[in-house]
Interface confidence: low
């Protein structure tokens, strides 16, 4: 199709070489097409999202994304050629940064419903550069945490070294929806709740004598509880003796609950005590069996191919540890009678 009639938008992605970050492009279809195709995803200030039942029938993936090769070759379907770029409804997600993402991206409706729709397309010229400005040592991260129940803030990484007074007008989106109220380089959250978690995008316009473009950054915001003040507790085994049958295989499970820590390095391991000797057992990997905002339950098993007489003289000890401290639970095997 002819892309000469597409509306054009220029975007700049300046990525930090020292952190993982993502990027998004919204399919900014001109009115009135936007309401057909992306109604609940990315909206201009003219269109407020509203999760009303009557909108449920809209197919939100009704747009097609292409990349325009620089050598003038035909347009390429994003989904076929670029595994690190994912289309989610009307949004294009770039999972990894790099200058190779620079280029022209075109989106248009899949279904052409009227003659007017033929010319309904957007061309986004994306320039991707590594961050060279070393003067701002403490620029905001692309991963930010908000502490539940407290006041918090979300900073626009590309503007975090500027004072609020110097900052240009910023447009913020949360999970693809325009945040109409927010206009500064930092969003202050009065009280943090779990629904504040999500993908935030901040845009501002930068101009020179020749042209202007949108500088965009993406921030993944996580809502967290305060770091635990408690050492982990062992939920299982509860008893310190376990009845077993000699010659039979045996699995003993150790389940421990670890409170939330921002820097989380849980330790869960089994070791064996035999008279004066003590050694760690190479057991299957630990696995997380339940994870909530406040804590995580991790399980690790010790597997004996067959219980021997010698095992009855040993103590099997589960050891768990976090940054606060450690807990142990020992199990003595006892032969089943009768």
């Amino acid at each position: 199709f002819n892309i000469s009639g597409c509306s054009t938008k220029k975007l700049l992605w300046t990525y930090s070489t020292r952190s993982e970050e993502e990027f998004v492009l919204f399919c900014d279809l001109p009115e009135p097409q936007k309401s057909h195709f992306c109604h609940r995803n990315r909206l201009s200030p003219k269109q407020v999202p509203e999760h009303l039942p009557f909108m449920g029938s809209n197919d939100l993936s009704d747009v097609q994304w292409y990349q325009q090769p620089s050598n003038g070759d035909p347009l390429e379907d994003i989904r076929k050629s670029y595994p690190h770029i994912i289309q989610d409804k009307c949004t294009l997600h770039f999972l990894t940064p790099g200058v190779n993402n620079s280029g022209s991206y075109i989106c248009r409706p899949k279904m052409i419903k009227s003659p007017y729709d033929v010319a309904c397309c957007v061309k986004m010229i994306l320039e991707v550069k590594p961050q060279t400005n070393a003067s701002c040592e403490y620029s905001a991260s692309h991963k930010q945490d908000l502490l539940l129940g407290s006041t918090g803030s979300i900073s626009c990484p590309s503007l975090s070294c500027q004072s609020d007074a110097q900052s240009p007008a910023v447009t913020w989106y949360k999970n693809g929806k325009l945040l109409s109220v927010e206009r500064s380089n930092r969003i202050v959250v009065d009280e943090v709740y779990d629904y504040h978690q999500g993908t935030y995008v901040c845009d501002y316009t930068q101009s020179d004598t020749v042209s202007s473009w949108t500088v965009r950054a993406v921030v993944q915001v996580r809502t967290i509880v305060g770091d635990t003040k408690l050492k982990p507790d062992i939920l299982d085994p509860v008893e310190d003796t376990l009845e077993v049958e000699l010659g039979k295989p045996l699995t003993i499970s150790c389940k421990a609950r670890f409170g939330f820590e921002r820097v989380f390095n849980p330790v869960i391991k089994w070791y064996i005590k035999d008279s004066d000797l003590e050694w760690e057992v190479s057991v299957p990997e630990a696995k997380s069996i339940k994870s909530t905002l406040k804590d995580e339950i991790i399980e690790r098993n010790i597997i004996l191919e067959k219980v021997t007489q010698r095992d009855l003289r040993r103590k099997f000890v589960c050891f768990v540890q976090n940054s606060i401290g450690n807990t142990t639970q020992s199990v003595q095997l006892k032969e089943k009678r009768g």
């Epitope: 200030p45 003219k46 269109q47 407020v48 999202p49 509203e50 999760h51 009303l52 039942p53 979300i154 949360k174 929806k177 325009l178 945040l179 109409s180 109220v181 927010e182 969003i187 202050v188 959250v189 009065d190 009280e191 709740y193 779990d194 629904y195 504040h196």
Partner: antibody
């Protein structure tokens, strides 16, 4: 059918307390809805009272005049919204509507028929 | 809190008339505005949101316009069932909750 039904409205003396209920049917509170109370004094306009975010957290929001006296809550297992009203005054006399907001935008797109609260000695 | 001022507070009109109701916000709310219709003894009914988007099942004679601080609800040809009270409501969306401020209402009565 998706609907909301309020109950608990009554005649109460000034300084008294009352708890209003709103039973939801046809949809689940566990979805991320804002459930709100809006009131209307006789012959007057609509006035927003409070909302609760019925997602994974029970976040509550109040009109400035309602803070401290009114408490919004919900019971997910019963799919019911509540408004506990304390230290009632004559000016709290109104029809209290329960309303559901869509998503995290607050347009009330589903309303109950209202329950009348009369505060009088 | 943002104040919403509606005018007129009441108006009398005949069937077939074109009716215009205005709503003014005390600060810029972009297009984050809803309009409701309420009949005596009934709950309000959502007509328009996002200043100009018609809600499901609402007749096309209703339309909304405006952005920033000034908004208008227009009924192109008043029908007998349209005699009711109309309210505007600010529906700002930000990270922090912005109260659902309603306008004072406009009562449309038969001339």
């Amino acid at each position: 059918e998706v609907q909301l039904e309020e109950s608990g409205g009554d005649l109460v003396q000034p300084g008294g307390s009352l708890r209003l209920s709103c039973a939801a049917s046809g949809f689940s509170f566990s979805r991320s809805y804002y459930m709100c109370w809006v009131r209307q004094a006789p012959g007057k306009g609509l006035e927003w009272v409070a909302c609760i975010y019925a997602g994974s957290s029970d976040s509550t929001y109040y009109a400035s005049w309602a803070k401290g006296r009114f408490t919004i809550s919900r019971d997910t297992s019963k799919n019911t919204l509540y408004l506990q009203m304390n230290s009632l005054r004559a000016e709290d006399t109104a029809v209290y509507f329960c309303a559901r907001g869509g998503g995290i935008i607050y347009t009330q797109n589903l309303w109950g028929q209202g329950t009348l609260v009369t505060v009088s000695s | 809190d943002i104040q919403m001022t509606q005018s007129p507070s009441s108006l009398s009109a005949s069937v077939g008339d074109r009716v215009t109701i205005t709503c003014q916000a005390s600060e810029d709310i972009e297009s984050y505005l809803a309009w409701y219709q309420q009949k005596p003894g009934q709950a309000p009914k959502l007509l328009i949101y996002s200043a100009s988007t018609l809600a499901s099942g609402v007749p096309s004679r209703f339309s909304g316009s405006g952005s920033g601080t000034d908004f208008t609800l227009t009924i192109s040809s008043l029908q007998p069932e349209d005699f009711a009270t109309y309210y505007c409501q600010c529906i700002l969306y930000g990270v922090n909750f912005v109260p659902n401020t309603f306008g004072g209402g406009t009562k449309v009565v038969i001339k």
